[in-house]
Interface confidence: medium
């Protein structure tokens, strides 16, 4: 079905589309005289060069060396396939509903699935992963520990931009009046530690207390800010005299 | 190629069934296959009800079952399955799924389209 084989066309002779219509758009044979239904990504497409034609736009018929086991299964497709459709642009893109999707296809195909659901349609917002506020993954631990030792605490945040992580020693004054102290501050046993991960668009953050002094003593709170909002968590350090006075829950060790 | 239903059977009114149709056959690839499921009751003519395209990611009802229930398809046990919630007694009719080749994004909803058929399963609703 190569175009230097294509007779008068014939509409007449055409096989009918499906009378629901086709999901992905009509698209045309390798004579460019009956419609078809376009091929969808992961769909089969291809035999002559020709065939390329039989994607949904957007995509391209990519040739397979091998036969795909994927959702297509052993006979991928019938005689003469020899590829599958892919999405032309394989960069992420951020949809109406807030889902990051893996290419613009990818979207095409939700939307697609939200309308036969008698849902809204699903549009591109932006290129690129959407934006979220930060969440913490993993807060920070309440520690209890003996004076001179050392001790820290962790934060994992994430964000979309990435945020930006900071540590305060929140102090309470009278009358329930909270005020916060940007940390390291002018501390000399306190060191603040930062780095991206362990995910993408992931930052953990420590703080080091080395040695352990009375006044160290109090809430520390981990706070992760983006364009999108902030989030925050925190956790109290407790200095006792001696290990003794260190509380133990039945079936776990205290945090040291 | 052989279709073959199960899950059929006598419900009350506002019950529930899930309906299988199990597929076999050697040449059979079911994974290469779009499904439906129709009804025949009494003196009517078969009446397609839902449909799932080949890779299970598109879904199709009509509006006498849309709401109440639902299509889906496991490839790797060959079956497609089909939810029937709060059952009114207009649903009673023997069951029967479909199958046709394609691999496009793509609802069949007339009995000519499909190519193999299951022996059907009886639904009775009573009030």
């Known amino acids: 079905s190569s175009s230097d084989t294509c007779g008068p066309c014939e509409p007449a002779s055409c096989p009918p589309l499906p009378p629901l219509g086709c999901l992905l758009g009509e698209t045309r044979d390798a004579c460019g005289c009956c419609p078809m239904c376009a091929r969808g990504e992961g769909e089969p497409c291809g035999g002559g060069g020709a065939g390329r034609g039989y994607c949904a736009p957007g995509m391209e018929c990519v040739k397979s060396r091998k036969r795909r086991k994927g959702k297509a299964g052993a006979a991928a497709g019938g005689p003469g396939v020899s590829g599958v459709c892919v999405c032309k642009s394989r960069y992420p893109v951020c949809g109406s509903d807030g889902t990051t999707y893996p290419s613009g296809c990818q979207l095409r195909a939700a939307s697609q699935r939200a309308e036969s659901r008698g849902e809204k349609a699903i549009t591109q917002v932006s290129k690129g992963t959407c934006e979220q506020g930060p969440s913490i993954v993993t807060p920070p631990k309440d520690i209890w520990n003996v004076t001179g030792a050392q001790v820290y605490l962790s934060c994992e945040v994430i964000g979309i931009p990435t945020p930006v992580l900071i540590w305060n020693k929140v102090k309470r004054g009278h009358y329930g009046v909270q005020r916060t102290e940007l940390l390291p501050g002018d501390r000399d046993n306190l060191a603040i530690q930062t780095r991206g991960g362990p995910e993408k668009h992931e930052v953990t953050g420590w703080v080091l207390v080395s040695p352990l002094s009375k006044e160290d003593a109090g809430e520390y709170e981990c706070h992760a800010s983006n364009s999108q909002g902030q989030a925050s968590a925190s956790a109290k350090i407790t200095v006792v005299d001696a290990l003794h006075e260190i509380p133990v829950k039945k079936g776990e060790g205290a945090e040291l | 190629v052989q279709l073959q239903e199960s899950g059929g059977g006598l419900v009350q009114t506002g019950g529930s069934l899930r309906l299988s149709c199990a597929a076999s056959g050697r040449s059979f690839t079911f994974s290469s296959y779009a499904m439906g499921w129709f009804r025949h009751a009494p003196g009517k003519e078969r009446e397609f009800l839902t449909a799932i395209t080949w890779s299970g990611d598109y879904t199709y009802y009509t509006d006498s079952v849309k709401g109440r229930s639902t299509i889906s398809r496991d490839n790797a046990k060959n079956t497609v399955y089909l939810q029937l919630n709060n059952l009114k007694p207009e649903d009673t009719a023997v069951y029967y799924c479909?199958?046709?080749?394609?691999?496009?994004?793509?609802?069949?909803?007339?009995?000519?389209?499909?190519?193999?058929w299951g022996q059907g399963t009886q639904v009775t609703v009573s009030s």
């Open positions: 479909a199958a046709k080749f394609s691999q496009v994004s793509a609802f069949f909803a007339t009995v000519s389209e499909y190519e193999y």
